[in-house]
């Protein structure tokens, strides 16, 4: 008597955040007895696509040759073995950047900050937006933050960091988005280099409450709700 088929693993390469026009490959991994793989996209007719497994049969490839708004969204995959269909995979959120003009990222009072002091990163957009995201580059699991003001349209968002430690140093970019689609982001801002000087060390800095920190790929997204002034959206940023 076979147990329930384990849910497949779903991921995207080169990552789940893709610039408009770039290619992306979605992979679904199951077992050696998989005979077919199915990819479903939320709010699209199911199945969105079907593929035969690649040798040695435990995964399938779904190709998107050129990223557009239509491909952005939430995906799950399944595989079929002789005993039936598997459970659905955990969701994959495919995000497209380049949907809106790039915001401006700056540091207040300065991108040169002494360890132990405070700094605020300010993300500003030309047109009003309701979602702003901040990422730190070149980390294994870069931080991703969101700030949402009751869905109100804003031209900027502030990301306070206090107290600053050497861990905060690095290159940041921000994005802006409209709440009706968290899968469509602006072009990235120009990079901002945050330079931390001094020797005060705190290996586990805690961002202030308006900043939500992603722990890694196991995090599931928490969508902002109107009742929470500063609600966090957590995603693994590839």
């Amino acid at each position: 008597q076979a147990g329930p088929l384990p849910k497949p693993t779903l991921w995207a390469e080169p990552g789940s955040v893709i610039s408009w026009g770039n290619s992306v490959t979605i992979w679904c991994q199951g077992t050696l007895e998989a005979r077919e793989y199915r990819l479903d996209k939320e709010e699209s007719p199911a199945p969105w696509d079907r593929q035969n497994p690649l040798e040695p049969k435990n995964k399938a490839r779904f190709s998107i040759p050129s990223m557009t708004e239509d491909y952005a969204g939430r995906y799950r995959c399944y595989y079929r073995s002789p005993v039936g269909w598997s459970q659905p995979s955990d969701p994959l959120e495919l995000v497209m950047t380049g949907a809106y003009s790039k915001p401006t990222l700056s540091a207040l009072p300065s991108p040169l900050v002494t360890s132990g002091k405070s700094v605020t990163l300010l993300c500003q957009s030309r047109s009003p937006m309701d979602t702003f995201l901040l990422i730190k580059e070149r980390a294994a699991h870069p931080l991703l933050h969101l700030r949402s003001e009751h869905g109100a349209q804003q031209h900027q968002a502030e990301f306070p960091m206090s107290p600053v430690t050497s861990v905060h140093g690095g290159t940041y970019r921000c994005f802006s988005s409209h709440g009706f689609s968290h899968y469509l982001l602006s072009h990235p801002s120009d990079p901002l280099e945050l330079i931390v000087s001094g020797s005060l060390e705190d290996p586990r800095p805690s961002p202030t409450r308006s900043v939500s920190t992603a722990a890694g790929p196991e995090d599931q997204p928490l969508m902002p709700t109107g009742s929470v002034p500063h609600s966090g959206l957590r995603r693994h940023w590839e």
């Epitope: 147990g3 077992t31 435990n58 002789p82």
Partner: antibody, heavy 116, light 107 residues
Framework: EVKLVESGGDLVKPGGSLKLSCAAS????????MSWVRQTPEKRLEWVAT????????YYPDSVKGRFTISRDNARNTLYLQMSSLRSEDTALYYC?????????WGQGTLVTVSS | DIVLTQSPATLSVTPGDSVSLSCRAS??????LHWYQQKPHESPRLLIK???QSISGIPSRFSGSGSGTDFTLTINSVETEDFGVFFC?????????FGAGTKLEIK
């Protein structure tokens, strides 16, 4: 907690036979592909055999094909490796692993020594 | 059979350093390349699967990259407990094969 415990390793003469077992717990054994990998005295890792979740498909490298047989008893949550016509180069620490794309869980190993 | 060549054979690093370990395949693997760490008297443990996919419970300082024939395991800011032998393994075609390993020593 996923746990894999190998047993059955022993000192055996060239040409002899041995059957290894791997007791699995902490996951739905019958739903996962399983493998055996061995580590030689020189610390090299060599894949030995793989069996699909229901036991319908088995895979071997040429070095053990026809001499080793991988099997499983899903009712007992146990994986087996029947080894015959053993050679000195089969001397190794034998591990069983759960195969989920990659070998994501390994047992502690059981030592097989082939020597006259 | 696909041959995996790992380099360097041995690497001696100081805690806090970042290191890159290489695994080169004799033919293209797409992304079917996995990384394991083995400490003395312990079983191997999976660090990265499918070239870049992180594994639950593995510290985020371990990351993987590459596709085709060239793959890299990077350890950002090595810690003292990161010593051991690191193996790559391919699952692109039978027979599955392993590299000979890179030994990481902590100075």
């Amino acid at each position: 907690e996923v746990k894999l415990v190998e047993s059955g390793g022993d000192l055996v003469k060239p040409g002899g036979s041995l059957k290894l077992s791997c007791a699995a717990s902490g996951f739905a054994f019958s739903s996962y592909d399983m493998s055996w990998v061995r580590q030689t005295p020189e610390k090299r890792l060599e894949w030995v055999a793989t069996i699909s979740s229901s036991g319908s498909y088995t895979y071997y490298p040429d070095s053990v094909k026809g001499r080793f047989t991988i099997s499983r008893d899903n009712a007992r949550n146990t994986l087996y490796l029947q080894m015959s016509s053993l050679r000195s180069e089969d001397t190794a620490l034998y591990y069983c692993e759960r195969l989920w794309g990659a070998m994501d869980y390994w047992g502690q190993g059981t030592l097989v020594t082939v020597s006259s | 059979d696909i041959v995996l060549t790992q380099s360097p054979a041995t690497l001696s690093v100081t805690p806090g350093d970042s290191v890159s370990l290489s695994c080169r395949a004799s033919q293209g693997l797409t992304n079917d390349l996995h990384w394991y760490q083995q400490k003395p008297h312990e079983s191997p443990r999976l660090l990265i699967k499918y070239a870049s996919q992180s594994i639950s419970g593995i510290p985020s300082r371990f990351s993987g990259s590459g596709s085709g024939t060239d793959f890299t395991l990077t350890i950002n800011s090595v810690e003292t407990e990161d010593f051991g032998v690191f193996f790559c393994q391919q699952s692109n075609s039978w027979p599955f094969t392993f590299g000979a390993g890179t030994k990481l020593e902590i100075k």
